[in-house]
Interface confidence: low
């Protein structure tokens, strides 16, 4: 299994943005990388969000995604936003090397993301 | 040394206050109990806060304390306000019998208080 | 050095009130406790009770109704007073130091670190 | 009150042997537990304290283990004078009740 690295612990901003970095150790030069995250909460596993790396393209998320990321190398800068307080929970990065062959996995230990969900502001007169 | 428990984590809220339960395994009955709060940061450990607590009376801190508690029986409830990003530390709680002898002191493992500062609401027109 | 040396009747008669004494010199009454412990014929060791240096007293349930414990600081002397004896209170009377082992700044433990020779009492018409 | 239960209530070992004593408290009692050692007609001596911490002046061959419920105190080679009987202690709130003790004897 390929070795993937990510911070324990990150705090959402106030805005619900939380941003990581997933790095893994590449076995090779891939020039097609899928990227997953994964939440688990409950015990229970959900996708959030995933793209795929294509060599000298962007990191691209699907339209109504709501991650974000850089690819630089063997690290991804990933970003969530929207987050709510219900968010809360651990985030997986799991790094797939699909091309060229052969194919390698590697799955983080996860990274937990605590949001706090803000005040609301005073009505303005 | 007596058992102290303590949250591993606990997440300030957007105003700043957070709560946990710092909960001893007493030996016996004590009629005098001090209870200090410490934060450890970069290796360097401060004090927060202290209180003794006396039998029938009420857990007091001093007036510009930034806690506030409530004791039943052998656990302490303990809230600690005007936080700020910086703040976030490990907070650790200290619990001494004092009296009847004997002293008994349980140091707990720390609760680690992630405080997010909040957005500034927009000025009102 | 330490040292503690118990005195008082060897005899005494049922339903009466056993007096001892215990002599202590090399540690001040003003720091530690002292506990009294006694020893049946051919049997074990039973805590019996003991008194702080600021004169807090604490005693073993069974014999709480019939014991007082005191301390002249003055003569260097503590006193072991149970009342209403019978046969089954025949027994070697020992006091002992109780000492607070503290290290790390953390951490007390206690233990009764030197005891005397010990006193032979019978309870006997 | 806390219980202390201590085995063997006796025990026959040669000089040279390895020789280990437990004690089971009825509660948690946090380490808080002496070990003493008594000869006949002697005063309890303090062996160790805390558990597992030698007295000063009490020889490296005794030790002590143990956190919660279970302890143990180890002889690592016997030597004539210690055949005696062993106490264990807890020290964990009031009142401060013993092990019924463990007569090491000469086999």
């Known amino acids: 299994a390929m070795h993937v690295a990510q911070p324990a612990v990150v705090l959402a901003s106030s805005r619900g943005i939380a941003s990581f970095v997933c790095e893994y150790a590449s076995p090779g030069k891939a020039t097609e990388v899928r990227v997953t995250v994964l939440r688990q909460a409950d015990s229970q596993v959900t996708e959030v969000c995933a793209a795929t790396y294509m060599m000298g393209n962007e990191l691209t998320f699907l339209d109504d995604s709501i991650c974000t990321g850089t690819f630089n190398e063997s690290r991804v800068n990933l970003t969530i936003q929207g987050l709510r307080a219900m968010d809360t929970g651990l985030y997986i990065c799991k790094v797939e090397l699909m091309y060229p062959p052969p194919y390698y996995l590697g799955i983080g230990n996860g990274t937990q993301i605590y949001v706090i969900d803000p005040e609301p502001c005073p009505d303005s007169d | 040394a007596m058992h102290v428990a303590q949250p591993a984590v606990v997440l300030a809220s957007s105003r700043g206050i957070a709560s946990f339960v710092c909960e001893y395994a007493s030996p016996g009955k004590a009629t005098e109990v001090r209870v200090t709060v410490l934060r450890q940061a970069d290796s360097q450990v401060t004090e927060v806060c202290a209180a003794t607590y006396m039998m029938g009376n009420e857990l007091t801190f001093l007036d510009d304390s930034i806690c506030t508690g409530t004791f039943n029986e052998s656990r302490v409830n303990l809230t600690i306000q005007g936080l700020r990003a910086m703040d976030t530390g490990l907070y650790i709680c200290k619990v001494e019998l004092m009296y009847p002898p004997p002293y008994y002191l349980g140091i707990g493992n720390g609760t680690q208080i992630y405080v997010i500062d909040p957005e500034p609401c927009p000025d009102s027109d | 050095q330490v040292q503690l040396q118990e005195s008082g009747p060897g005899l005494v008669k049922p339903s009466e009130t056993l007096s001892l004494t215990c002599t202590v010199s090399?540690?001040?009454?003003?720091?530690?406790?002292l506990s009294w412990i006694r020893q049946p014929p051919g049997k074990g060791l039973e805590w019996i009770g003991y008194i702080w240096y600021d004169g807090n007293t604490n005693f073993h349930p069974s014999l709480k109704s019939r014991v007082t414990i005191s301390k002249d600081t003055s003569k260097n002397q503590f006193s072991l007073k149970l009342s209403s004896v019978t046969a089954a209170d025949t027994a070697v009377y020992y006091c002992a130091k109780t000492e607070g082992h503290y290290y790390g700044s953390n951490y007390g433990y206690y233990a009764l670190d030197y005891w005397g020779q010990g006193t032979s009492v019978t309870v006997s018409s | 009150d806390i219980q202390m239960t201590q085995s063997p209530s006796s025990l026959s070992a040669s000089v040279g042997d390895r020789v280990t004593i437990t004690c089971r408290a009825s509660?948690?009692?946090?380490?808080?537990l002496a070990w003493y050692q008594q000869k006949q007609g002697k005063a309890p001596k303090l062996l160790l304290y805390?558990?597992?911490n030698l007295q000063d002046g009490v020889p490296s061959r005794f030790s002590g283990s143990g956190s919660g419920t279970d302890y143990t105190l180890t002889i690592s080679s016997l030597q004539p004078e210690d055949f005696a009987t062993y106490f264990c202690?807890?020290?964990?709130?009031?009142?401060?009740?013993f092990g019924q003790g463990t007569k090491l004897e000469i086999k």
């Open positions: 202690q807890h020290l964990w709130g009031t009142p401060y009740t």
């Open positions: 805390a558990a597992t």
């Open positions: 509660e948690n009692i946090y380490s808080n």
């Open positions: 090399g540690f001040s009454l003003t720091s530690y406790g």
